[in-house]
């Protein structure tokens, strides 16, 4: 139901009076205040913004808003002694070099302290050899070149196109792989949208254009240097030989101007099919090498890029609850951005200020939330999610008995098409809800509601009338609340049409073309679906913090579970014959996801029964609904992920942006047929599936009657 | 074949005006910028303007701004620069030229006309 | 604006000859540096974009090489057609700017 209930109010001060009070132009504003110059992590211009918001959050009338800070590590060009990768010929000459820098965007020419492209947290190196062209470099592309092609990665340096996966995962193949070096492209073929113009004339990536971004394999650590704890000023820090998820290659990247120049002249085997071909005017050739006449040639990587440790800022604004002052619920998104940050991170940003600025005018006219909300503007998001963890790191102990939610604000758009949302199943009838109430910006929906738009546009493959909701993955701030705390998390936002746009994220992500007029001229001119984002993020941080029972619907949990079980099973029994010969039953998983649907149909039962005007009643069924996400927490985590804790929900194994359902089962039967000891894989897998059904038998337990 | 045909040069008196044009063929007119470089007698080229028929954005030297006015007719495939108050300095063959993109440098060249600013 | 230093002025060379003109920009321009020849009466003809890339038709004994600011247009061996004006021209920010051009002359 809605929430009309907070306290010391007059009626008026509801959802609605909420919702209206977010402005469409109070988001542009924002968005053009903070993608004026760059917001790069660790520089002077974020410790600015960072004590911007800090001001502006108090004026809009937050209880108290603070700066927490951390010296992490961070990865930074050599101003002197830039990255880039050439060609040589036989004497060593350098006959073809990339690009040093993009060039400006209009009006951005005399801007300073443009970060150039880099892949940070490389490490140093000149490596020279033959190139390699190892597709996404996606494990399935490692498996068609070793296994199928025959071809040895060793001592190459490979080139990969960006996008499918997080560009970390391509980079720890290629290292498993044996590659010295690696050079990330982005190909037209996944980052320009056929019959749209390049950046300035259209929203499509130039050919001098680059996707920086971070190489880390952190696995939910934070700061390298300091995993499980905060890095504050008694911490005690690793040598960089121990820290977490550094890579051990040199890594750059290039656009694809640059990349035909090194794809042309590609010999060595064909590609495999055509899954392989991008759109550039080269033949794809694997290699490895140079073709004929230039076989002599060489490839030669110049990297010089350092690691620091690095004073970081978070903002962390409170607005206390009235009633329950001890449950939070937490709205936060990051503020660093590589260069201007047009969309990433500053149309979430943007979005968050705007959902303080009416929080805080409602707060103003003498309301208060029923339970506590944080605001937050992390730090070092785009660095390996550092600044978020590290304070979860250091509050654990408060989220893990307080955190009812976490709700992410990072880029409000990717594109203009529907909506997309991300989160527990916890929130799956909150999202449907509450999108059954807002108006739909879309053209051709005019008066008709988001959820119908949505629902045409993004239908879920499972369930008709009923949009498309996916897992949470990883590559963003939630990680650490909802994959090493185990607090409920959603996240929304504006996308494109994934049918006929196939290309990976947008085409400008990460590059400097990344401005403000890129989102005003070309994404969202009046600012509707920054609005749209702006209602359904604060809408569910309203309706998180306001209502009296939590919108959280654990039959909806129940749901995904049975469907995640069939999915799992179905997988192992891809291999029967084992099977049969090492006894794998899923009998006992199958046997917790019935009783969980059991005990959660009559939880829910209770739940619309019980004496709400009874304050200790109320607080313990919450309790219940609170703590279920947190009941899927393994405190050993999964094997060799400590910090992913989730049994049910995972980042892939094989890219840190996707979600895996019952990770530890799926990566033990990952390829199992092809390990060396069939006994001990497939034993694995059986402890596994013990694992898993003991978590969800135990979490079907928190919601049973207490006595 | 790319062809760009310059024409409407001449003598002008000092102060007046002229429109040259640029009339393009063998392309895709939309697809490309065009560009205006001047080259006064015995003198090195000097980049004035660039339009974008795409979205009819302007970009001018310092030297012609508020002076020069780019524009074209999309219905013709032809650029025009139109130059007012001109001065001796503004004599020079003009060149119409294109570039596949904001950041690319220009592939075909008109073969130039010439302007004469004289009393 | 971004200056760009064209040297020599005047190069006087024989056929056969390896001829090398230098362009230094004011400040750095990545790669984004063109080269183009000019003959009398006639209008620029680009020979390489992007510092390195050679323009489809032109004879490979033109070279370029360079990033940053100091950027060298090679002619590996000197023929006749050769003799001609070049000028360097940067194309990574408005305004366009060019050196201020070359004369390859008959030794």
């Known amino acids: 139901k809605s929430s009309n209930e907070a306290t010391n109010i007059t009626p008026k001060h509801n959802m609605k009076a909420f919702l209206d009070e977010l402005k469409a132009e109070n988001i542009k504003k924002f968005l053009y205040n903070f993608t004026q110059i760059p917001h790069l992590a660790g520089t002077e211009q974020n410790f600015q913004l960072a004590k911007q918001i800090q001001s502006q959050w108090k004026e809009f009338g937050l209880d108290s808003v603070e700066l927490a800070h951390y010296d992490v590590l961070l990865s930074y060009p050599n101003k002197t002694h830039p990255n880039y990768i050439s060609i040589i010929n036989e004497d060593g000459n350098e006959i073809f070099n990339t690009s040093l820098f993009e060039p400006p965007p209009p009006g951005y020419e005399n801007v300073s302290d443009i970060v150039p492209p880099f892949s940070a947290f490389s490490p140093q190196g000149m490596p020279e050899g033959d190139l390699v062209y190892v597709n996404y470099a996606r494990t399935e592309d490692f498996f068609k070149l070793e296994r199928d092609m025959k071809i040895n990665c060793s001592g190459k340096i490979v080139i990969a196109r960006y996008g499918k996966v997080f560009r970390g995962n391509k980079v720890k193949n290629a290292q498993l792989a044996g590659a010295k070096g690696v050079i990330l492209y982005s190909d037209p073929a996944d980052y320009f949208a056929p019959g749209v113009k390049s950046y300035p004339d259209g929203w499509n990536l130039p050919g001098g254009g680059v996707q920086r971004g971070n190489i880390l394999n952190l696995n939910g650590a934070g700061d390298p240097l300091t995993p499980g704890y905060p890095a504050n000023e008694y911490a005690y820090r690793r040598g960089i030989a121990e820290a977490v998820g550094l890579p051990s290659i040199p890594v750059h990247p290039i656009g694809y101007y640059d990349a035909q120049k090194l794809l042309e002249k590609m010999g060595g085997s064909a590609p495999p099919d055509s899954s392989w071909r991008g759109s550039l005017k080269v033949p794809y050739n694997v290699g490895p090498g140079f073709t004929g006449n230039f076989s002599t040639q060489k490839v030669k990587m110049h990297i010089h890029s350092t690691n620091e440790v690095t004073r970081i800022y978070n903002v962390i604004g409170t607005l206390r609850g009235a009633v329950e002052p001890d449950r939070y619920v937490i709205l936060g998104g990051h503020r660093d951005s590589w260069v201007f940050g047009g969309i990433d991170p500053q149309s979430g940003a943007a979005v968050v200020h705007e959902i303080v600025r009416s929080f805080g005018t409602l707060k103003k006219e003498g309301w208060r939330p029923r339970r506590t909300i944080l605001f937050a503007s992390w730090d070092a998001e785009e660095f390996g999610l550092l600044g978020s963890t590290e304070w979860a790191e250091e509050n654990s102990r408060l989220l893990q008995e307080r955190g009812v939610a976490y709700i992410n604000a990072d880029s409000s758009i990717e594109g203009n098409y529907t909506l997309r949302v991300d989160c527990t199943p916890l929130m799956y009838s909150l999202v449907h809800n509450l999108t059954k109430e807002l108006k739909s910006p879309d053209e051709g929906f005019e008066g008709k509601s988001l959820y119908e738009s949505w629902t045409k546009k993004s239908p879920s493959p499972e369930f008709s009338g009923m949009p498309r909701i996916s897992k949470l993955g990883s590559g963003n701030d939630f990680e650490v609340f909802f994959q090493r705390l185990g607090i409920a998390s959603g996240r929304a936002r504006y996308t494109k049409n994934w049918e006929t746009n196939k290309f990976s994220g947008y085409p400008l992500y990460h590059s400097v073309y990344e401005t403000y007029e890129l989102v005003e001229k070309f994404y969202d001119p009046m600012f509707k679906y920054h609005l749209t984002v702006a209602q359904v993020r604060g809408g569910m941080v309203f309706e998180l913090a306001n209502s009296i029972v939590l919108p959280f619907d654990c039959r909806d949990y129940a749901v995904v579970l049975r469907k995640y079980a069939d999915k799992i099973y179905s997988i192992s029994m891809k291999h029967p014959q084992e099977m049969k010969t090492y006894s794998v039953s899923f009998d006992s998983l199958f046997s917790a996801v019935k009783n969980f649907t059991e005990i959660a149909s009559k939880f829910s039962e209770r739940l619309q029964d019980f004496d709400k005007s009874n304050p200790i009643v109320l607080r313990m069924m919450n309790d219940q609904l609170m703590f279920l996400e947190r009941a899927f927490i393994d405190p050993l985590g999964l094997p060799d992920r400590p910090f992913y804790r989730h049994v049910i929900y995972a980042p892939s194994s094989h890219n840190k942006y996707a979600g895996e359902s019952f990770p530890g089962i799926y990566d033990a039967l990952f390829d199992i047929e092809s390990k060396v000891d069939p006994s001990k894989a497939w034993g694995e897998v059986k402890r596994q599936i013990y694992v898993a059904a003991f978590t969800v038998q135990a979490a079907a337990e928190t919601l049973s009657e207490v006595a | 074949e790319v062809q760009l045909l310059e024409s409407g040069g001449g003598l002008v008196q000092p102060g007046g005006s002229l429109r040259l044009s640029c009339a393009a063929s063998g392309y895709t007119f939309t697809d490309y910028y065009i560009h205006w470089v001047r080259q006064a007698p015995g003198k090195g080229l000097e980049w004035i303007g660039s339009f974008n028929p795409y979205n009819d954005y302007t970009s001018y030297a310092d030297s012609v701004k508020g002076r020069a006015t780019l524009s074209v007719d999309k219905s013709k495939n032809t650029a025009y620069l139109q130059m007012n108050s001109l001065r001796a300095e503004d004599t020079a063959v003009y060149y119409c030229?294109?570039?596949?993109?904001?950041?690319?440098?220009?592939?075909?060249w008109g073969q130039g006309t010439l302007v004469t600013v004289s009393s | 604006d971004v200056q760009i230093t064209q040297s020599p002025s005047t190069l006087s060379a024989s056929v056969g000859d390896r001829v090398t003109i230098t362009c230094r920009a004011s400040?750095?321009?990545?790669?984004?540096l063109a080269w183009y020849q000019q003959k009398p009466g006639k209008a620029p003809k680009l020979l390489i974009h992007s510092g390195s890339s050679l323009e489809s038709g032109v004879p490979s004994r033109f070279s370029g090489s360079g990033s940053g600011t100091e950027f060298t247009l090679t002619i590996s061996s000197l023929q006749p057609d050769d003799f001609a004006t070049y000028y360097c021209?940067?194309?990574?920010?408005?305004?366009?700017?060019f050196g201020q051009g070359t004369k390859v002359e008959i030794k």
């Open positions: 400040k750095s321009i990545s790669k984004y």
């Open positions: 021209q940067q194309h990574i920010e408005y305004p366009w700017t």
């Open positions: 030229a294109r570039s596949d993109g904001y950041y690319d440098a220009m592939d075909y």
